[in-house]
Amino acid sequence: TQNKALPENVKYGIVLDAGSSHTSLYIYKWPAEKENDTGVVHQVEECRVKGPGISKFVQKVNEIGIYLTDCMERAREVIPRSQHQETPVYLGATAGMRLLRMESEELADRVLDVVERSLSNYPFDFQGARIITGQEEGAYGWITINYLLGKFSQKTRWFSIVPYETNNQETFGALDLGGASTQVTFVPQNQTIESPDNALQFRLYGKDYNVYTHSFLCYGKDQALWQKLAKDIQVASNEILRDPCFHPGYKKVVNVSDLYKTPCTKRFEMTLPFQQFEIQGIGNYQQCHQSILELFNTSYCPYSQCAFNGIFLPPLQGDFGAFSAFYFVMKFLNLTSEKVSQEKVTEMMKKFCAQPWEEIKTSYAGVKEKYLSEYCFSGTYILSLLLQGYHFTADSWEHIHFIGKIQGSDAGWTLGYMLNLTNMIPAEQPLSTPLSHSTYV
C-alpha cells in the first residue's frame, strides 16, 4: 500500500501594513510544533492593495471595505479553510495615519473603526487594527531582519544559509524608508543611549540587546518631497518653480492647497499670491542635494552626537539592512549591488537626474509617469539622508545592504510585529527537543 502523507501541522498569520502610500497584506506560515525555534516562520504571500493608503479614505470611509476586498479574498484562498478560524489577523497603520491623527484624532479613529468592522467580516481571528508607534516600527523591522538572517540563533554554522550572514552573531542595524517616515535602529557599540526615548531593551532567545531606534516623522520620501516643495516655493519669484530634483523638460502643476494639506509642511506655510504653481524640472543632482540638505537642521545638538533636528544618534556600528523604499528606489536605479561604491552611486545619480524627461519616458515606457518622475528626487534624498542625515561615509557605505527579501520573506516591520504578538520570540533560549534540530530523522 502507498504511504499517505501526514497532514501538515502548520499555522498561519496575516498582517496588514497600512502605510501612507498603500496597504500590503502578508501571509506567514510556520510548523506548529516549532513555534519557538528561530527562523521557522516564512512569508507565503504578499498582496498589495491597489490604491492609496487608508488615511486617504477619510472623506469616504464607506469605501474602505471594498478597497480591502481583493486581498482579503486572496487570503481566504491561500489559507486552508480548516485553518481560517485560528488564523490571527493584525493591521498596523504607520506614519500616514500618525499624521492624520495629528490633524484629527476623531477622523483617524473613524478610519480605524471602519477598517476593524470590514476585517471582522472575514472568517479569520481578527485581533485588531491600530496605529503603531515609530519606535515599534523601527524595533519590529530590526527584529524581522535579524530573525530572518538567523542572528538570534545560538547555533553557529560552518556554512552560510542566508545572504549577508557572517558566522558571528552580531546583529544587523535596520534602515527603513516609507512614504511618510523613516526609521534607524541598531545596537550601538558599548555606547550609552543618551536619550531614553531612543532606547529599547530586549531579551531574546536568552540574550540581552540594548537597541537604539528613532523614527523621523515627515522624513519619508513622499513627505520629504512635499516639505522640499513647500520650502522652495517660499522663495520662488512667481508661480514657476524651477526644480533641480526633476528631469529637464518635466512639468507638473501643483495646487497650493494640496501642498499645505499635510502637517509636514506647516513650518513652511505662507500666504502665496497664487493658487497653483508649476514645477519645471532642471535635473541637477548637486542642486537637488543642496536643497534637500536644507530640510535637515544640523545647527543644534543637545547630545554628544546627533542625526538632525536635535535627535541623538550614536556612532554607527556594524552592518545595516536598508529596506522598503530604500530598496525599491535603489533597485529601480540599479544601485543595490554590494560592489557599487558610494562615489559610483553619486555619479550614477548625477547622470540619471540630468537625463531629459522625454528620454526617461521612452527608456522606461512601462513605468507609470507619476512614479517615474520621482526617482531623481528619491535617489538623491536617500543619499542625502544616509550620508548627511545618518553620517554614513564613503567607507561605511559598504556596510549598507539594500535588501528586498531575505529567504523569501519581505524585509519590513510586519513579521517582527506578528512574531511579538503571537509570542513566538521567547525571552529565553528554548530547550531543544531530541529530534527538533537533528540532521536526520
Partner: nanobody
C-alpha cells in the same frame, strides 16, 4: 488622468429597467475597484454599487437584488444593470474609481464626470 463618461440614463416607469455604461479614457485594469454613485437633488452623493479588480461586488442595501454591477477591463468600461426601478432611484448617476491612485498623495481620480440622469416616475 483617466476621464470617465457615463451614459445610458433616461426616463422610465416604476418597475422598468435601464443599463448604464461608464467608459474610461485610460486603462481601468490597475484600479482597485470601480463604483457607481448617485446624487438625488438636495442629497449627498452615495455609493450604490462597486466591483473590485478581482470581480467581487458590493451593493448598498437599498439596491441589493435589483442592481448588478459588472466591468469589462478590455473595453475599459463599467456597467450598472438596474431592474425593478423605483421612484426613489431617481438621481444623477456617476461612476468613479474607489480610492484611485496618488501623486504626492493627491487623489488622481477625484475627477467626476458629468453623470447621467435617471428619472423613475409614472
Amino acid at each position: 488622468q483617466v476621464q470617465l463618461v457615463e451614459s445610458g440614463g433616461g426616463s422610465v416607469q416604476p418597475g422598468g429597467s435601464l443599463k448604464l455604461s461608464c467608459a474610461a479614457s485610460g486603462s481601468i485594469s490597475s484600479i482597485n475597484a470601480m463604483g457607481w454613485y448617485r446624487q438625488a437633488p438636495g442629497k449627498q452623493r452615495e455609493l450604490v454599487a462597486a466591483i473590485t479588480s478581482g470581480g467581487y461586488t458590493n451593493y448598498a442595501d437599498s439596491v441589493k437584488g435589483r442592481f448588478t454591477i459588472s466591468r469589462d477591463n478590455a473595453k475599459n468600461t463599467v456597467y450598472l444593470q438596474m431592474n425593478s426601478l423605483k421612484p426613489e432611484d431617481t438621481a444623477v448617476y456617476y461612476c468613479n474609481a474607489i480610492g484611485g491612485s496618488t501623486w504626492f498623495g493627491e487623489d488622481e481620480y477625484d475627477n467626476w464626470g458629468q453623470g447621467t440622469q435617471v428619472t423613475v416616475s409614472s
